[in-house]
Every structure is written in C-alpha cells, then in structure tokens.
Amino acid sequence: LIIGFGISGRHSITVTTVASAGNIGEDGILSCTFEPDIKLSDIVIQWLKEGVIGLVHEFKEGKDELSEQDEMFRGRTAVFADQVIVGNASLRLKNVQLTDAGTYKCYIITSKGKGNANLEYKTGAFSMPEVNVDYNASSETLRCEAPRWFPQPTVVWASQVDQGANFSEVSNTSFELNSENVTMKVVSVLYNVTINNTYSCMIENDIAKATGDIKVTESEIKRRSHLQLLNSKAS
C-alpha cells in the first residue's frame, strides 16, 4: 500500500495505490483511491507512467480528456466514471502487455488540494493449475496442468502424508510455448503416487503462486486449487 500526500499540509489530500500484477492478454486494474470531493467537476485524475512522455489517462470535469494521451495507451484505458465521485480513481487497462510493466503515478486534484502516489505494476502470466489422475500411465501417476505462465515458473510437488519429502526425482516438468510465443503451458507429472493421500502441485514465479491439490482415495477424487498474487502491496 502506498499512501501519498500533497506537498503543503493544508492543501494536501491522501491518495492510496496498491501494487498489482497484470495477466498479459487480459484487462488489468491499476488501483487508486483518494479523499472524495462533493463536486465531480472539481476532480482531476491523471495517470502517468515513468519513462512515458504523454499521459496514460486524464479525467477532468466529469469526463475523459485524452488529447495528451500517449500513443501506446490509446483506446486502452478507462476510469470507472460513476465511482470517481466516491474517491475511486482506479484505471482499467485493456489487453495487458509485457511492456505495460513499470512505475505508474496516480495524481489527483480536488477542491481540497492535491496528492499523488506511485504504483508498481508487474506483468506476466499466471493461471490456475488442475491436477488429474493420469489413467494412461503404466503406474499411478498425477498430471498437473496450467495453461498460461510467464516468466517460467518453478513447479514443486508436496504430499500431506510425506511432508517435507523431495519429489524432484519422481516428477517431470515441461514447458510448452503457447501460440502467441510469450506465455507457456506448464505440465508436471508425478509418478508412483499412493492412494489415500493428498498431493499438491505448487507453481510459482515472481508474480504469482498457484496450488492445485488432489485427494485420491479408493472411492473418490477431490480437487481444489487457488492462486495468489505475490506483490499486492498497498502504498
């Protein structure tokens, strides 16, 4: 969490941003909130990016003002116009690319004063893994698949019964480049699994950590998965 203040105390407002990550190919959100004003026409929102000459986005007098917008952001940005009045200056970014990573500044002017806060935005690819029993294999085998990751992640297997065990000798992980030649499909196979045990496939890079669990008993198979972004720090 980054909280920024204006320069002179009496005319400063609090602006808060949250470091976040964008999943390339999807739309992303750059979060920013500020002390609201009672009049929309008095609020100015400017989004800037370090190293970019033009503006990322500007919203003033109740509408977008995009004459100074940098070329790389044309048609790709929007604020939540109906939420500006309650202090939401978050920016929506269309079709996130690797090049969108960097330091952004959310700069706010209201009738109460000015304020700004920086935001570190990482870009990559991350997706939920799914673990299945591989019935085609000769021995009891688990297969963990996740469709999109970048940068290349690490994959670690763990089990509830054999806590602390190192499965690197009985697992095999491959990375297959997807059609857009950036992200990769992750496939990891775990051999010699035992019944009545819960196994976890953990995929992690510097942006996200995802886990796929599978519980295999004689009568049922239960699955669970979750994904966590690693750099969601507020500022």
Partner: antibody, heavy 123, light 107 residues
Framework: QVQLQESGPGLVKPSGTLSLTCAVS?????????WSWVRQPPGKGLEAIGE???????NYNPSLKSRVTISVDKSKNQFSLKLSSVTAADTAIYYC????????????????WGQGTLVTVSS | EIVMTQSPATLSVSPGERATLSCRAS??????LAWYQQKPGQAPWLLIY???TRATGIPARFSGSGSGTEFTLTISSLQSEDFAVYYC?????????FGQGTKLEIK
C-alpha cells in the same frame, strides 16, 4: 443508431489477398469504441480476426496475425481488412462489428454488427 | 486461447416452455461473457453482456447467469421468434473466442 456496412469482392483467388472495407454511419469511428472483424465459415461458428482503435492501435488473433492487416480511415469514417495468402479455409461470411464499450465497462463484446459479406476463395 | 464449449449442440423445446443453454470456458473468464442470437442469413445479435446484463431492448424473458467457467442462458417462456442459434463469447482474454453454438429448435 450506428450502422455498419461491409463491402469488397465476393470471390478471391487462392494465394491472393482478401480486401474488405466497413463503412460506419450514424456514429463516429473516432469514438471510444474499438472496431472489429469477425468471420464465420458457412455453417460453422464465429472467429474474431482482429480489432482497431481510431488511433491505429490494433490487436490481431495470433492464429491469423502473420496474414492480417486492419487499418482505419478517419476521414471516410471506415476501417478495412486485408488477409493475405488466402486458401479455401478462409471462405467465410466476414462481419464488421463495434465493440460495446461504455465508460467503466469492459471492452470486448459486440453491440453493433454489419450484415456480413460472403467471401469465397476459389480459382 | 480460451476454448468455449456450449451444450447441448441442439435443444428441442416447445413454445411457451423454458430453455436452458450452457457455456463452459476452458479457464476462468470472470464475468466477461456475452450471449448472442443468430437467425439464418442474419448477423449475430447481442443479448447479454457481463454474464447477466441484458443489452438494450432485449426482453426480460432472456436472462444470463454464472461466472468463472460455467455460464447459463435461460429463456423463460419461448416465443416463436426465439428459435435460432445461440453463441456465447468470452472477452476476458484476447483473442476473444466464441462457443460453437447451440441450435434451439421447435419440438
């Protein structure tokens, strides 16, 4: 009411280039919307080809990226599609469509469509 | 790319009855899903966006639900003009992709 109208040759030779234009009326191509091309082979489903913003920014479907060019002509309020090295597999109805963007909403669904034009690739 | 799978391929329902069409995404698309209706010789027509928001002028008998990977389009009381092909489309991830369609026919 926004209207879109596709135009261009209905027959293209294999290995040639398919060229289509979409004329926009009842609204400005310089609005906040993206403008798309979508195709539908006879009796089959829909496939997004690519999209363009009035500034010239584009997104192309990776499966067609090496063969596709979409351009915009703001003075004529129209945008165009070029698809090179065509084969019989490119025979389809080609639609132009407008992205349904409204402030704060996501981009990507299509609220206005042209009536479509059938392009056949054959010698 | 995200693969959208619609079921059933064909659905036979009598006028006045309820129709339920399903759409599944190969990975989460959040609520970024649209439904279209297409009649023979016509362009698709937007019915639903945001998984559940009806487009302008669409009758209340059309409703959408779901999020993540599982979505449903429900037509509460079928009218004669509702028999057509229905497509779902995800716009969470580029390239935007469509399902293969469900043909709704008169029983």
């Amino acid at each position: 009411q926004v209207q879109l109208q596709e135009s261009g040759p209905g027959l293209v030779k294999p290995s040639g280039t398919l060229s289509l234009t979409c004329a926009v009326s009842g609204g400005s191509i310089s609005s906040s919307n993206w403008w798309s091309w979508v195709r539908q082979p006879p009796g089959k489903g829909l496939e997004a080809i690519g999209e363009i913003y009035h500034s010239g920014n584009t997104n192309y479907n990776p499966s067609l990226k090496s063969r596709v060019t979409i351009s915009v002509d703001k003075s004529k309020n129209q945008f165009s599609l070029k698809l090179s090295s065509v084969t019989a597999a490119d025979t389809a109805i080609y639609y132009c469509a407008r992205d349904g963007y409204s402030s704060g909403w996501y981009w990507g669904y299509f609220d206005y469509w042209g009536q479509g034009t059938l392009v056949t690739v054959s010698s | 790319e995200i693969v959208m799978t619609q079921s059933p391929a064909t659905l036979s329902v009598s006028p006045g009855e309820r129709a339920t069409l399903s759409c599944r995404a190969s990975q989460s698309v959040n609520s970024n899903l649209a439904w279209y209706q297409q009649k023979p010789g016509q362009a698709p027509w937007l019915l639903i966006y945001g998984a559940s928001t009806r487009a302008t002028g669409i009758p209340a008998r059309f409703s959408g639900s779901g999020s993540g990977t599982e979505f449903t389009l429900t037509i509460s009381s079928l009218q004669s003009e509702d028999f057509a092909v229905y497509y779902c489309q995800q716009y969470n991830h580029w390239p935007y992709t469509f399902g293969q369609g469900t043909k709704l026919e008169i029983k």
